[in-house]
Amino acid sequence: SGRGEAETRECIYYNANWELERTNQSGLERCEGEQDKRLHCYASWRNSSGTIELVKKGCWLDDFNCYDRQECVATEENPQVYFCCCEGNFCNERFTHLPEAGGPEVTYEPPPTAPT
């Protein structure tokens, strides 16, 4: 049973490699998948000496380890690329590193959008 499932239809999109891959750099992504399959949002980033370098954000295909995650939280200790996934529209806007060894929790907020 899929109780408490938050349906994901749209995610924040970002691609640091947008020029080479000929995509947009940032925006929103409408998630598309097969019928009856769940969809998620994800974020991936690097942490170089405390400087956060966003790699990619977007939609993520049905993945059991993403089920019922309302927030995007990476738990790996010190990977080359941090990864988190979550369920719910735009749930990857903010992302957090909460290392399993009990280090400090670090949440990354998107920069405020300039007023138009």
């Epitope: 049973s1 899929g2 109780r3 408490g4 499932e5 097969e34 009856d36 399959k37 769940r38 295909l61 049905d62 993945d63 059991f64 380890n65 993403c66 089920y67 019922d68 995650r69 939280v73 738990t75 990864f83 996934c85 399993e100």
Partner: antibody, heavy 118, light 110 residues
Framework: EVQLLESGGGLVQPGGSLRLSCAAS????????MAWVRQAPGKGLEWVSG????????FYTDSVKGRFTVSRDNSRNTLYLQMNSLRAEDTAVYYC???????????WGQGTLVTVSS | QTVVTQEPSFSVSPGGTVTLTCGFN?????????PSWYQQTPGQAPRTLIY???TRSSGVPDRFSGSILGNKAALTITGAQADDESDYYC??????????FGGGTKLTVL
């Protein structure tokens, strides 16, 4: 070091019940989905059940639906499989497994044997 | 009902190369099924070899590789060794909370 230790197996009569436990250590249990996989004597592996990080989503193979219930206690770092109305064909070694991103089983326990016989 | 098929048995000479395959009755296997491969010797728990089609699990020698070949997932062992003699299982993630195991391949190294 990641460790998964199953317990609770044994001999039970057809129609009886057992509760299997899987004690997890070496990782933050609440951060990972979990699964049960079984192997009948001389047969292949068969996925039995899966449970999401919160326990809010549970899934079963058709042959155990309505008889088995998977649950987890994140405060005790323990996964459970309640097995009711057991049948001879449920005889197997039951493994618990940790689920990682891209939905694969990255760590396995050593298994506990369930024998259903009169 | 989805059935995942593997060769029941296979033999390879020491130092040889063997490719085990994993298909299913409902169409082509693609990377979206996140195919993974497990090795099991009698009386032991399974060991994870390959996940997400072609990523080796930590500690797995590079003699083992995963791929998609045509409409199937594949596990290739190059330079087979005596201790590769085991049962090999593929698993497909069907989504919506469901996994399906293949029937397994018994590999003999002789």
């Amino acid at each position: 070091e990641v460790q998964l230790l199953e317990s609770g197996g044994g001999l039970v009569q057809p129609g009886g019940s057992l509760r299997l436990s899987c004690a997890a250590s070496g990782f933050t249990f609440r951060n990972y989905a979990m699964a049960w996989v079984r192997q009948a004597p001389g047969k292949g592996l068969e996925w039995v059940s899966g449970i999401s990080v919160t326990g809010g989503s549970t899934f079963y193979t058709d042959s155990v639906k309505g008889r088995f219930t998977v649950s987890r206690d994140n405060s005790r770092n323990t996964l459970y499989l309640q097995m009711n109305s057991l049948r001879a064909e449920d005889t197997a070694v039951y493994y618990c497994a940790k689920v990682y991103y891209t939905s694969f089983f990255d760590y396995w326990g050593q298994g506990t044997l369930v024998t259903v016989s009169s | 009902q989805t059935v995942v098929t593997q060769e029941p048995s296979f033999s390879v000479s020491p130092g040889g190369t063997v490719t085990l395959t994993c298909g299913f009755n409902s169409g082509s296997v693609s990377t979206s099924y996140y195919p993974s491969w497990y090795q099991q010797t009698p009386g032991q728990a399974p060991r994870t070899l390959i996940y997400n089609t072609n990523t080796r699990s930590s500690g797995v020698p590079d003699r083992f590789s995963g791929s998609i070949l045509g409409n199937k997932a594949a596990l290739t062992i190059t330079g087979a060794q005596a201790d590769d003699e085991s049962d090999y299982y593929c698993v497909l993630w069907m989504g919506s909370g469901i996994w399906v195991f293949g029937g397994g391949t018994k590999l003999t190294v002789l």
